[in-house]
Interface confidence: low
């Protein structure tokens, strides 16, 4: 059977969800006038930067745009950016894309994106709404980096 | 058509842990796109939410009374229950249970049970 | 002291319009989180009269509306009846609290 990948509803656990505004992503609270994107999630066939200790290694993208989450340096700090890509396209190369691939690890019920090119960065969402999506490496209060993936048809 | 039914003790003596549960019927409660929460109210006052667990099994806490309370589900009984523990006076009041739909937000508390009066006293 | 702000007391005479106000703050409604309305007739469970700032479940009559703005939300009833006395509340989502917040509740009394 081809692979394809899997669709999530993803929000953190102050009920923000990712919305796309422009070609970048925030995050806004759940309601009835905001349009939350559905992430697609697939597994990375290449097993060079592997650890499952930190997790499954994936790609992520937005479905419905031919968009992919990549970590990139800007100004000496890694940066979490969309570049337009298919998601199927990075699945299909046999050498696994390293600036597009992420960890994804469970933590209970959250499931937590940790970036293959930079250890220790993990996606986040701020706790004020309207905030892009972003790399931290400081998990705790300030920073939600564990998030409810909801399974969509 | 869904139905909720609170049962549990009417009387906690203080410092114990009060235990409710509620009994869906008409419904799963596995089905996708519910959650599940309990909310009190008062003699003479308004409602507060305690909390809420929702089909991913995630749970939801007020903030105020979290390091009390745990929410859980029995899903061979099709239950979900509440258990607030070191109860003083100030935790009488009516329980209710509660469910409402999520799909995409949360579309309010539609159903609810007809609560259940617990008094705290020795 | 409840987060979501509601008058106490309305009233009304049968017929008439009346509306309950419930005000927030930026973290709440004014973070465009949506507002729910509940009905409790004495003695019984709230009833949901509107979900998502605007909208009635099935049952409800449209003599009851919702509507939101900025940091407030408001619930109008028109062609007041004697069976619409009852406690109302407003709930939403509060995300510097993690969770739902609702109002100290307003009394309408028909006259």
């Known amino acids: 059977r081809e692979a394809a990948p899997k669709s999530y509803a993803i929000r953190d656990s102050r009920q923000m969800v990712w919305v796309l505004s422009g070609n970048s992503l925030i995050a806004a609270p759940l309601s009835r006038s905001i349009k939350p994107v559905t992430l697609h999630l697939i597994a990375c066939r290449d097993t060079e930067f592997s650890d499952k200790e930190k997790g499954n290694m994936v790609y992520l993208g937005i479905k419905g745009k031919d968009l992919c989450l990549f970590c990139a340096e800007i100004q000496g700090k890694p940066t979490l950016q969309l570049k337009e890509k298919n998601i199927m396209d990075l699945y299909v190369e046999k050498k696994a894309q390293k600036p597009f691939l992420f960890f994804h690890n469970k933590e209970g019920s959250t499931s937590v994106f940790q970036s293959v090119s930079y250890p220790g960065w993990f996606i986040a969402t701020s706790t004020t709404s309207g905030q892009p999506i972003f790399l931290t490496k400081e998990r705790g209060i300030t920073n939600n980096t564990n998030f409810y993936l909801d399974s969509v048809e | 058509e869904l139905q909720l039914q609170e049962s549990g003790p009417g009387l906690v003596k203080p410092s114990e842990t009060l235990s409710l549960t509620c009994t869906v019927s008409?419904?799963?409660?596995?089905?996708?796109?519910?959650?599940w929460g309990w909310i009190r109210q008062p003699p003479g006052k308004g409602l507060e939410w305690i909390g809420s667990?929702?089909?991913?099994?995630?749970?939801y806490y007020n903030t105020s009374l979290k390091s009390r309370v745990t929410i859980s589900v029995d899903t061979s009984k099709n239950q979900f229950s509440l258990k607030l523990s070191s109860v003083t006076a100030a935790d009488t009041a009516v329980y209710y249970c509660?469910?409402?739909?999520?799909?995409?937000?949360?579309?309010?508390?539609?159903?609810w049970g007809q609560g259940t009066l617990v008094t705290v006293s020795s | 002291e409840s987060v979501l702000t509601q008058p106490p007391s309305v009233s009304g005479a049968p017929g008439q319009r009346v509306t309950i106000s419930c005000t927030g703050s930026?973290?709440?409604?004014?973070?465009?989180?949506?507002v729910h309305w509940y009905q409790q007739l004495p003695g019984t469970a709230p009833k949901l009269l509107i979900y998502?700032?605007?909208n009635r479940p099935s049952g409800v009559p449209d003599r009851f509306s919702g509507s939101k703005s900025g940091t407030s939300a408001s619930l109008a009833i028109t062609g007041l009846q004697a069976e619409d006395e009852a406690d109302y509340y407003c709930?939403?989502?509060?995300?510097?609290?993690?969770?739902?917040?609702f109002g100290g509740g307003t009394k309408l009394t028909v006259l």
């Open positions: 509660a469910t409402g739909k999520y799909y995409e937000t949360y579309l309010g508390f539609d159903v």
């Open positions: 008409g419904g799963s409660i596995t089905a996708s796109n519910y959650y």
């Open positions: 667990i929702d089909y991913t099994g995630s749970t």
């Open positions: 930026s973290s709440n409604i004014g973070a465009h989180y949506d």
């Open positions: 998502g700032n605007d």
């Open positions: 709930q939403s989502y509060d995300y510097s609290l993690s969770g739902y917040v």
